[in-house]
Interface confidence: low
Amino acid sequence: SWMWNQFFLLEEYTGSDYQYVGKLHSDQDRGDGSLKYILSGDGAGDLFIINENTGDIQATKRLDREEKPVYILRAQAINRRTGRPVEPESEFIIKIHDINDNEPIFTKEVYTATVPEMSDVGTFVVQVTATDADDPTYGNSAKVVYSILQGQPYFSVESETGIIKTALLNMDRENREQYQVVIQAKDMGGQMGGLSGTTTVNITLTDVNDNPPRFPQSTYQFKTPESSPPGTPIGRIKASDADVGENAEIEYSITDGEGLDMFDVITDQETQEGIITVKKLLDFEKKKVYTLKVEASNPYVEPRFLYLGPFKDSATVRIVVEDVDEPPVFSKLAYILQIREDAQINTTIGSVTAQDPDAARNPVKYSVDRHTDMDRIFNIDSGNGSIFTSKLLDRETLLWHNITVIATEINNPKQSSRVPLYIKVLDVNDNAPEFAEFYETFVCEKAKADQLIQTLHAVDKDDPYSGHQFSFSLAPEAASGSNFTIQDNKDNTAGILTRKNGYNRHEMSTYLLPVVISDNDYPVQSSTGTVTVRVCACDHHGNMQSCHAEALIHPTGLSTGA
């Protein structure tokens, strides 16, 4: 039978010779060389070689337990002469023995953690973990112990668990917010000769409400005119709070003072300022100075910090009311007036009124701001505010006149007010319709009677209430015996039609048609426009081919035979 135990081999052998593993031996071996030992399985012939005569096994390479801790091989012993096995093939194990060749490695290079400031000693912060690739079942090569290299006296670490805890009382974020802690993990249970690794833990103290708001000054003074309407901001006060975020939020309130019912304080949530505003109408003649006691407080307070004192501060606000001499006030914010464009000079359009709101009720005089009426189209009665024309108007030149009227206190010319006047000029039918463009057209020599050769359009500068209605006709002097007719389309357009079959450009190369365009408003306005018609040779599609090379634009007039 075979004679061996389990083989053990130390990893990371650095000797110059092959590393001896052990000996395969059969009790049938008489030492006369008649037996041959054969090795097969994991690494046989490569990592492990056997002396076939003696059964001695050697390792040819340096082995790493962390790569492969166990090798399973098979042993055979055969009779050299017969080739028959003298022992049954048997499996055996080579177990690689661990040495401490791996340092602990943390699961993270850098940890980040937060802990509230002012935490009790021993408050959990974060747990760090290091792993060691060595054999945890044998010796202490993988037994990791944690210690703190940097970060004392603020933090401590539990040697076995890697749990980091606070170690100092009353750590104050407002003094220091960031801490960098270095933790070491050492194997061999932390003993001499152990291997180690480190990690950095960045710890941020999070804010708690341990600081009250504080006014930077005990007294504030603001001025406001007596004319300030309710809601007017007078000034801003600001308390500062060393905390952050919600813990630094401040609410302001008025707690005392003779201005308690005259003023408000609004907390600006975004700027964390207290805005002092007017609550009721002020009157300089009744009271010139108010004092307020304003309090700034944290809306969210942690009871455990109440021993530090009240989470509020107060300041005195002195408000000086300023006297106001107010300018005249117009009866309207703006005036809209209208007048026909044919109004004669000195026609009254309307009037404005303004009054001095002061108790003195100073008399007021009116004037037109000439920067807004450079052409002096309008004037105003300085005493009663009546507006009248001083020049003729034309709606087609300017539809709206935007002028400014000034009311000035007679006894105090510095007190003045302005109001816009919007004067609309109403349309009167004072413009004749005319052609929308210069019309020059042509007629083919072979044209048939009643053929449309041109559509006419008209425009009118006026703007009648019911819209334009134009009528078109040939001028009386051309109506009889004309070679063309005008057909009014009743839609503000007209067509020129041929009146005969065929035209001869050698007899008459150009016709001038005087067309009368009238509107349908009162008083009726009309104008005469001339259409030039050239006689041309055309192809069978009616496309112009050639015309006499005469001037294209003719003076207004009538060719014979039009």
Epitope: T204, A239, S240, A242, V244, E246, A248, E270, T271, E273
Partner: antibody, heavy 121, light 107 residues
Framework: EVQLQESGPGLVKPSQSLSLTCSVT????????WGWIRKFPGNKMEWMGY???????SYNPSLKSRMSITRDASKNQFFLQLNSVTTDDTATYYC???????????????WGPGTMVTVSS | DVQMTQSPSYLAASPGESVSISCKAT??????LAWYQQKPGEAYKVLIY???TLQSGTPSRFSGSGSGTDFTLTIRSLEPEDFGLYSC?????????FGSGTKLEIK
């Protein structure tokens, strides 16, 4: 050390939306306030808005109707979306931190390097 | 909105000189003003807040003054690294607004 880095497309077509990301390292965006500012060609600068440590937002009234700022605290990133862009939105966009730990200090103590965005068809 | 007018828009100076940049607000903003510096290819950096308080890390040759509507940033004895773009910003009320910038270049 706090570091901010803007990222996003350098070219956006008119009428489309512009989306930018600000990645913050060295500081959690769940503390302090984090804003967007842009600088137009010619150096004119405009504050666009911010997102607070608690996720509350405030926008410049001139942009309020077409912008939004959001965040992903787990990634320590905050984002800008500007809708219906025109060529007038061509600018360098910056993200920055506002250290208002004493209430109302709306200046910016750490800035990103900026990212240039061109709006063009 | 509070408008911030910064002047000059361009300034050329030599190392060792002193320079001043002005920032004016259209209404009183108390001392809620910050000054920033931006060097080419770098991020903005806050130099001064609350009108005159130096941000940690800002060299003492920088100083801020003013209150209400008129503010000044002064740099005494310019160093080569001081050249760049300077901007002011009010944070008295929202929307927060910035000055148009001053480009400080080496003469």
């Amino acid at each position: 050390e706090v570091q901010l880095q803007e990222s996003g497309p350098g070219l956006v077509k008119p009428s489309q939306s512009l989306s930018l990301t600000c990645s913050v390292t060295g500081y959690s965006i769940t503390t302090y306030y984090w804003g967007w500012i842009r600088k137009f060609p010619g150096n004119k600068m405009e504050w666009m808005g911010y997102i607070s440590y608690s996720g509350r937002t405030s926008y410049n009234p001139s942009l309020k109707s077409r912008m939004s700022i959001t965040r992903d605290a787990s990634k320590n990133q905050f984002f800008l979306q500007l809708n219906s862009v025109t060529t007038d939105d061509t600018a360098t966009y910056y993200c920055a931190r506002s250290p208002i730990n004493h209430g109302g200090y709306w200046y910016f103590d750490f800035w990103g390097p900026g990212t240039m965005v061109t709006v063009s068809s | 909105d509070v408008q911030m007018t910064q002047s000059p828009s361009y300034l050329a100076a030599s190392p060792g000189e002193s320079v001043s940049i002005s920032c004016k607000a259209t209404k009183s903003i108390s001392n809620y003003l910050a000054w920033y510096q931006q060097k080419p290819g770098e991020a903005y950096k806050v130099l001064i807040y609350s009108g005159s308080t130096l941000q940690s890390g800002t060299p003492s040759r920088f100083s801020g003054s003013g209150s209400g509507t008129d503010f000044t940033l002064t740099i005494r004895s310019l160093e080569p690294e001081d050249f760049g773009l300077y901007s002011c910003q009010q944070y008295y009320e929202k929307p927060l607004t910035f000055g148009s910038g001053t480009k400080l270049e080496i003469k």
